[in-house]
């Protein structure tokens, strides 16, 4: 049995340009201790989209639902979507360390952008 699952329930999300996109992610536990980060793409060239404690992400807002009893919500909303935002977004759990160690990624959510 897995100690931690990172769940991205939507395989894809389609949003009109200028609107906001909600990317959902839950984790079954806070343990192991460490942050959840959001990336677009995979590999060394992936782009950091949101980190709870580091960096400035003016278009990204955490939209967690704290009432969820059986898991932790790490969903985000990205505002003012443009075609350049299209891609696959991953919710990634890290174990705290020096540096933090990547443990598990969600399956990814593909964001497509429709014309206005």
């Amino acid at each position: 049995e897995e100690e931690l699952q990172v769940i991205q329930p939507e395989k894809s999300v389609s949003v009109a340009a200028g609107e906001s996109a909600t990317l959902n992610c839950t984790a079954t536990s806070l343990i192991p201790v460490g942050p959840i980060q959001w990336f677009r793409g995979v590999g060394p060239g992936r782009e950091l989209i949101y980190h709870q404690k580091e960096g400035h992400f003016p278009r990204v807002t955490p939209v967690s639902d704290p009432t969820k009893r059986n898991n932790m919500d790490f969903s985000i909303r990205i505002s003012n979507i443009t075609p350049a935002d299209a891609g696959t977004y991953y919710c990634v759990k890290f174990r705290k360390g020096s540096p933090d160690v990547e443990l598990k990624s969600g399956a990814g959510t593909e964001l497509s952008v429709r014309a206005k």
Epitope: E1, E2, E3, L4, T28, S29, L30, I31, P32, V33, G34, P35, I36, Q52, T61, P62, V63, S64, P66, T67, R69, N70, N71, M72, D73, F74, S75, I76, R95, K96
Partner: antibody
Framework: EVQLVESGGGLVKPGGSLRLSCAAS????????MSWVRQTPGKGLEWVAT????????YYPSSVKGRFTLSRDNAKNSLYLQMNSLRAEDTAVYYC???????????WGQGTTVTVSS | DIVLTQSPASLAVSLGERATISCRAS??????????MHWYQQKPGQPPKLLIY???NLESGVPDRFSGSGSRTDFTLTINPLQAEDVATYYC??????????FGGGTKVEIK
């Protein structure tokens, strides 16, 4: 009904060792993060140790790190706290607590008393 | 360490009136918009019991006269109306991703 039953407390001399156990029933033990929290007489609560559901990850505050070791046996629905090099300040009631998400302590046992005195 | 300061240390309230307990954290306990602050009730000779999880969510089976509010560093537990069986000590607890997890010093609630 969730039940957590602690055992193994007692009187021990400074520098001695004790092993506390917590027997769990009424829930899927292997899915839960488990912890120990202690309460000193007339004082407040102090987190002592936490272990992940599968036993891979353990966490301790600096006050017990290197002296206490937390383990679990999911086949036996049991949690264990090995306490070595005990000090007078470790005297407390020790509670076993379960947490589905590793966030709040959802259920608590009745506690077992540890007294460290010469 | 994140220090949790509860106030007042003790509180005497008339039956049927409102009891309000404060918990202030030395730094934010919020992650992704969720406040990892929880409240417990402990009666003499008993273990603590979870009342409120993640700042404002009532644990199953807990009467709705208990409520929690707050975010980041400032949190409140409210009992309204206070009943005789609510005489107990109440603790706040933070479980953010900054170890160690810590508890407040407790607030003893009595009947005036």
């Amino acid at each position: 009904e969730v039940q957590l039953v602690e055992s193994g407390g007692g009187l021990v001399k400074p520098g001695g060792s004790l092993r506390l156990s917590c027997a769990a029933s009424g829930f899927t033990f292997s899915s839960y993060v488990m912890s120990w929290v202690r309460q000193t007489p007339g004082k407040g609560l102090e987190w002592v140790a936490t272990i992940s559901s599968g036993g891979t990850y353990t966490y301790y505050p600096s006050s017990v790190k290197g002296r206490f070791t937390l383990s679990r046996d999911n086949a036996k629905n049991s949690l264990y706290l090995q306490m070595n090099s005990l000090r007078a300040e470790d005297t407390a009631v020790y509670y076993c607590a379960s947490s589905l998400t590793g966030s709040s302590f959802d259920y608590w046992g009745q506690g077992t008393t540890v007294t460290v005195s010469s | 360490d994140i220090v949790l300061t509860q106030s007042p240390a003790s509180l005497a309230v008339s039956l049927g009136e409102r009891a309000t307990i404060s918990c202030r954290a030395s730094e934010s306990v919020d992650l992704y918009g969720t406040s990892f602050m929880h409240w417990y009730q402990q009666k003499p000779g008993q273990p603590p019991k979870l009342l409120i999880y993640r700042a404002s969510n009532l644990e199953s089976g807990v009467p709705d006269r208990f409520s929690g509010s707050g975010s980041r560093t400032d949190f409140t537990l409210t009992i309204n109306p206070l009943q005789a069986e609510d005489v107990a000590t109440y603790y706040c607890h933070q479980s953010s991703d900054e170890l160690p997890w810590t508890f407040g010093g407790g607030t003893k609630v009595e009947i005036k």
